[in-house]
């Protein structure tokens, strides 16, 4: 009786269980009653990452430097090339097919999370008591200067974009 299901790493063809090709190899011909499955290694700059019955290997991804991409992990016969972005840039998608410049946090906002090759800068508004007076992809919100600890008094209140201005205390005669 011909099988209706096959073991792991096998496939059913012409009422027969044939061995799948291992990662890094493609199918040339199915097995027969008398012969094994015939597989062939993928060519240079090609890959297959699973046990398969593919007749063509996939091409390695190209990390195009003109799109701000660079290689994170070189491709092999069993794995695709993994791209990431040049410093200061991040991927526009999970597939990392192109890069965009990291966003800067405007004055009044600080960096909550610094960007990586795959994620953009996350900004947060500076809460009361903190400020940021620059546009930056790295700077967090800074605390207002404590005038008291310097034996000074607040002459000008701080905002989310400016520090407080301290001055000397008025001396009573």
């Amino acid at each position: 009786e011909p099988p209706t299901a096959c073991r792991e790493k096998q496939y059913l063809i012409n009422s027969q269980c044939c061995s799948l090709c291992q990662p890094g190899q493609k199918l040339v011909s199915d097995c027969t009653e008398f012969t094994e499955t015939e597989c062939l290694p993928c060519g240079e700059s090609e890959f297959l990452d699973t046990w398969n019955r593919e007749t063509h290997c996939h091409q390695h991804k190209y990390c195009d430097p003109n799109l701000g991409l660079r290689v994170q992990q070189k491709g092999t016969s069993e794995t695709d090339t993994i791209c990431t972005c040049e410093e200061g840039w991040h991927c526009t998608s999970e597939a990392c097919e192109s890069c965009v410049l990291h966003r800067s946090c405007s004055p009044g906002f600080g960096v909550k999370q610094i960007a990586t090759g795959v994620s953009d800068t996350i900004c947060e508004p500076c809460p009361v008591g903190f400020f940021s007076n620059v546009s930056s992809a790295f700077e967090k919100c800074h605390p207002w200067t404590s005038c008291e600890t310097k034996d000074l008094v607040v002459q000008q209140a701080g905002t989310n974009k400016t520090d407080v201005v301290c001055g000397p205390q008025d001396r009573l005669r």
Partner: antibody
Framework: EVQLVESGGGLVKPGGSRRLSCAAS????????MHWVRQAPGKGLEWVAY????????YYADTVKGRFTISRDNAKNSLYLQMNSLRAEDTAVYYC????????????WGQGTLVTVSS | DIVMTQSPDSLAVSLGERATMSCKSS????????????LTWHQQKPGQPPKLLIY???TRESGVPDRFSGSGSGTDFTLTISSLQAEDVAVYYC?????????FGGGTKVEIK
């Protein structure tokens, strides 16, 4: 027998150009990726550039990006390195090496050709 | 870029003795997809081009004597010559084959004591 033979080396003035060639024989050239690697006199090895078997993928070292161009002609079993705006620090023996689709390593190297950049 | 650091710079060993050299990479060379470490060793004899010795950290290239062995994983790798022969006098380079730019260590020069 696998053979890689580089040619085109010689004395070049700073700012000048040179084109290196690598003639391949003893294997199916179009099935292999190719690299250029250089070695300054008395120094270690420095990777320069890579081109995939089908010309689709090209990578360069930052030190040569924008000045050097790697190319190949599979019909002529030849690899090339066009070197422009040459500097004294480009003085080296230039090797071509092949990369197969199994090991993904440089498994055969040519004998090298010496490029000297000097006024 | 991945920085490859080899030690020692040179090594003098008696014939028949063991020679061991180290190679450290500034980041892991482990391919997450196939779990192979893409660390390659090349041998360069005086006046000759480099020759592939070992790939994937420990797999000897065809024709390489079994006195040569490679080991390690992640960022720390070792090349061992179990019984040094006169023809093993050379500079040995480790190489990052994991990512571009491909980078080489500075080399370890092996001499006869």
């Amino acid at each position: 027998e696998v053979q890689l033979v580089e040619s085109g080396g010689g004395l070049v003035k700073p700012g000048g150009s040179r084109r290196l060639s690598c003639a391949a024989s003893g294997f199916t050239f179009s099935d292999y990726g190719m690299h250029w690697v250089r070695q300054a006199p008395g120094k270690g090895l420095e990777w320069v550039a890579y081109i995939s078997s089908g010309n689709r993928i090209i990578y360069y070292a930052d030190t040569v990006k924008g000045r050097f161009t790697i190319s190949r002609d599979n019909a002529k079993n030849s690899l090339y390195l066009q070197m422009n705006s040459l500097r004294a620090e480009d003085t080296a023996v230039y090797y071509c090496a092949r990369q197969d689709g199994y090991r993904y390593a440089m498994d055969y190297w040519g004998q090298g050709t010496l490029v000297t950049v000097s006024s | 870029d991945i920085v490859m650091t080899q030690s020692p710079d040179s090594l003098a060993v008696s014939l028949g003795e063991r020679a061991t050299m180290s190679c450290k990479s500034s980041q892991s060379l482990l391919n997450s997809g196939n779990q192979k470490n893409y660390l390659t060793w090349h041998q360069q004899k005086p006046g000759q081009p480099p020759k592939l010795l070992i790939y994937w950290t420990s797999t000897r290239e065809s024709g390489v004597p079994d006195r040569f062995s490679g080991s390690g994983s992640g960022t720390d790798f070792t090349l061992t010559i179990s019984s040094l022969q006169a023809e093993d006098v050379a500079v040995y380079y480790c190489q990052n084959d994991y990512t571009y730019p491909l980078t080489f260590g500075g080399g370890t020069k092996v001499e006869i004591k």
